[in-house]
Interface confidence: low
């Protein structure tokens, strides 16, 4: 018969014949022959292969380097890579999370709209009228100005986006 030019799914073409690919978690030791099946071996510890393959070497699990601010989010198996994430207070610089950078703080006059996660930075927003933030923080939202009226006081000093209002006693004198 004619040698095959294409093979079925989970097979590969070699020496004019179709051989079985190795399953995820295993690497190729030797190709099949007319008389023998493909020979595969499991990946070693700290190694993986995540597809049906003909690789002769397994891939090393990703190392979550603490010097780059990384820690293990999910331990790798023979079929999956280790997933890294960033330490508290840091976020990934890319989707692959190969390194981390410090979460930004929102300056006075700005509050946290969205707290940073392991993959996204802090989102800041300017404090609108009636709100203030007097600190540089990665967590604090804009706080509403104190309501002097509810304390039976009057505004002695107006608030800004960085400072609260200052309340004081009402003038009791009548004209």
């Amino acid at each position: 018969p004619e040698p095959p030019t294409a093979c079925r799914e989970k097979q590969y073409l070699i020496n004019s014949q179709c051989c079985s690919l190795c399953q995820p978690g295993q690497k190729l030791v030797s190709d099949c022959t007319e008389f023998t099946e493909t020979e595969c071996l499991p990946c070693g510890e700290s190694e993986f292969l995540d597809t049906w393959n003909r690789e002769t070497h397994c891939h090393q699990h990703k190392y979550c380097d603490p010097n780059l601010g990384l820690r293990v989010q999910q331990k790798g198996t023979s079929e999956t890579d280790t997933i890294c994430t960033c330490e508290e207070g840091w976020h990934c610089t890319s989707e692959a999370c190969e390194s981390c950078v410090l979460h930004r703080s929102c300056s006075p006059g700005f509050g946290v709209k969205q707290i940073a996660t392991g993959v996204s930075d802090t989102i800041c927003e300017p404090c609108p009228v009636g709100f203030f933030s007097n600190v540089s923080s990665a967590f604090e939202k804009c706080h509403p100005w104190t309501s002097c009226e509810t304390k039976d006081l009057v505004v002695q000093q107006a608030g800004t986006n960085k400072t609260d209002v200052v309340c004081g006693p009402q003038d009791r004198l009548r004209a």
Epitope: D65, G89, V101
Partner: antibody
Framework: QVQLVQSGAEVKKPGASVKVSCKAS????????MNWVRQAPGQGLEWMGN????????NYNQKFKGRVTMTTDTSTSTAYMELRSLRSDDTAVYYC????????????WGQGTTVTVSS | DIVMTQTPLSLPVTPGEPASISCRSS???????????LHWYLQKPGQSPQLLIY???NRFFGVPDRFSGSGSGTDFTLKISRVEAEDVGVYYC?????????FGGGTKVEIK
Amino acid sequence: QVQLVQSGAEVKKPGASVKVSCKASGYTFTGYNMNWVRQAPGQGLEWMGNIDPYYGNTNYNQKFKGRVTMTTDTSTSTAYMELRSLRSDDTAVYYCARLGLQLYALDYWGQGTTVTVSS
Amino acid sequence: DIVMTQTPLSLPVTPGEPASISCRSSQSLVHSNGNTYLHWYLQKPGQSPQLLIYKLTNRFFGVPDRFSGSGSGTDFTLKISRVEAEDVGVYYCSQSIHVPWTFGGGTKVEIK
């Protein structure tokens, strides 16, 4: 090994601009912020700002805002710092320095580029 | 801007003897994640600065263990347990928590 190689010395007239380059090798260029620090003759160190080559974000020292522009060319792993409207007190050695990520300190420095501003 | 003040300005030392440099910041350098973003650099004569200590106490790769950093909040110290001739140069403290990042004025260490 990590290496930062800077362009050669420059002599400029007041009011002119200078563009210093810093070619990085030995690491993934887009993974680390590049900083620029200058040192006037006989003086201490002054941080000018930094750039994240991955996103292109810049962080400038207010003192240089409007006069400095930091850029990168990821295809050649090169960072650039341009300083405009030069004055005599801009005469200094300009260093590029990589920001070590979890270190959050400047872990590798270029050899420095001397910029002399004189009429 | 955060002001970093170093003392002394000049430090004559005897090889084999200990040495200590102080650094004070005008604001706390402690981040909400618990880390203190205070670093020490050494600039040897005619060379670029080099990182010695990062985040208060951590020695950078290849830095001898005779160098140590300590302190908290706003007061910091770099100690050299036994000074060697190769340790001469200008030592700078620096902060990287508040933009603009700033450096101390430097302490010149020289052999007596």
